[in-house]
């Protein structure tokens, strides 16, 4: 049977917590990604940003999980209007910001 959306979001939060807690060296060698607007379409926007990071095993599971939340196919180099114009941040900061936002969505019961 399909995993309930609440459980899937919980799994994603757990994975992001693990990334932030287990981080020793700079995450993904300090790679920079486009900052995103967290107010709408957060899963696809996050995936569109993170998919451009290659060769970083630490976020591969996150990329796969975000893919499960995003209803359309996302490929590298693809950007939606949800990107914050011309602003790049480190992957570590991106993950922290995403985690804070997803935890709030979870607490509010907004799983879709």
């Amino acid at each position: 049977s399909p995993v309930p959306r609440s459980t899937a979001l919980k799994e994603l939060i757990e994975e992001l917590v693990n990334i932030t807690q287990n981080q020793k060296a700079p995450l993904c060698n300090g790679s920079m990604v486009w900052s995103i607007n967290l107010t709408a379409g957060v899963y696809c926007a996050a995936l569109e940003s993170l998919i451009n990071v290659s060769g970083c095993s630490a976020i591969e599971k996150t990329q796969r999980m975000l893919n499960g939340f995003c209803p359309h196919k996302v490929s590298a180099g693809q950007f939606s209007s949800l990107r914050v114009r011309d602003t790049k941040i480190e992957v570590a900061q991106f993950v922290k910001d995403l985690l804070v936002h997803l935890k709030k969505l979870f607490r509010e019961g907004r799983f879709n």
């Epitope: 709030k104 979870f106 607490r107």
Partner: antibody, heavy 123, light 107 residues
Framework: EVTLRESGPGLVKPTQTLTLTCTLY??????????VDWIRQPPGKGLEWLAH???????RYNPALKSRLTISKDTSKNQVVLKLTSVDPVDTATYYC???????????????WGQGTLVTVSS | DIQMTQSPSSLSASVGDRVTISCRAS??????LNWYQQKPGKAPKLLIF???MKPRGVPSRFSGSGSGTDYTLTISSLQPEDIATYYC?????????FGGGTKVEIK
């Protein structure tokens, strides 16, 4: 020391609104990751979760009672208030407030409880 | 809503006995399972959280285990002060739900 203390009317008439107050000691609901729950227990029965409020005013309710429940906080008084409208004798119970702390993963585990306040609904 | 089913509803055991209480969730709760002890006339007390973690001050004879939908509370050597009702609770997501309780008595 972390302590929670419930206060309520003791006796309420059917159809009236029950107002319960939980006063928090030893921690503040203005602190990130803090939450407070309300739980009730009818005499001789099990525990039923009613509502929850987080430090940032995010609220959740038991769907079976949502239309009758309102949870709010007064950070200046370090209090959480629960209102239950249109009470009925089946709402007779001991009402507890309890603290939840979210750390890392989001736990909903109530680590400190008040002593409870018995509310009887009767005419 | 996630339903929590506890068994047995009551049990009687001798001092020193090993006691196990079971709790089953209606769906996978990913180890977000808490146990509470409620002594007569008192408020519940958190005994175990996140399946097997213990708050400070909980005696070592209490332990928790399980995964997925099935969880267990074990008292390795029952003591007279353990007379109480024990409740499981899922902490995955609201609405938070409790098991019906297990009343533990001494033979």
């Amino acid at each position: 020391e972390v302590t929670l203390r419930e206060s309520g009317p003791g006796l309420v008439k059917p159809t009236q609104t029950l107002t319960l107050t939980c006063t928090l000691y030893g921690f503040s609901l203005s602190t990130s990751d803090m939450g407070v729950d309300w739980i009730r227990q009818p005499p001789g029965k099990g525990l039923e979760w009613l509502a929850h409020i987080w430090w940032d005013d995010v609220k959740r309710y038991n769907p079976a009672l949502k239309s009758r429940l309102t949870i709010s906080k007064d950070t200046s008084k370090n209090q959480v208030v629960l209102k239950l409208t249109s009470v009925d004798p089946v709402d007779t119970a001991t009402y507890y407030c309890a603290r939840t702390v979210s750390s890392g993963y989001i736990y909903y585990a109530m680590d400190y409880w008040g002593q409870g306040t018995l509310v009887t609904v009767s005419s | 809503d996630i339903q929590m089913t506890q068994s047995p509803s009551s049990l009687s055991a001798s001092v020193g006995d090993r006691v196990t209480i079971s709790c089953r969730a209606s769906q996978d709760i990913r180890n977000y399972l808490n146990w509470y002890q409620q002594k007569p006339g008192k408020a519940p007390k958190l005994l175990i959280f996140y399946t097997s973690m213990k708050p400070r001050g909980v005696p070592s004879r209490f332990s928790g285990s399980g995964s997925g939908t099935d969880y267990t509370l074990t008292i390795s050597s029952l003591q007279p002060e353990d007379i109480a009702t024990y409740y499981c609770q899922q902490g995955l997501t609201p609405p938070l739900t409790f098991g019906g309780g297990t009343k533990v008595e001494i033979k």
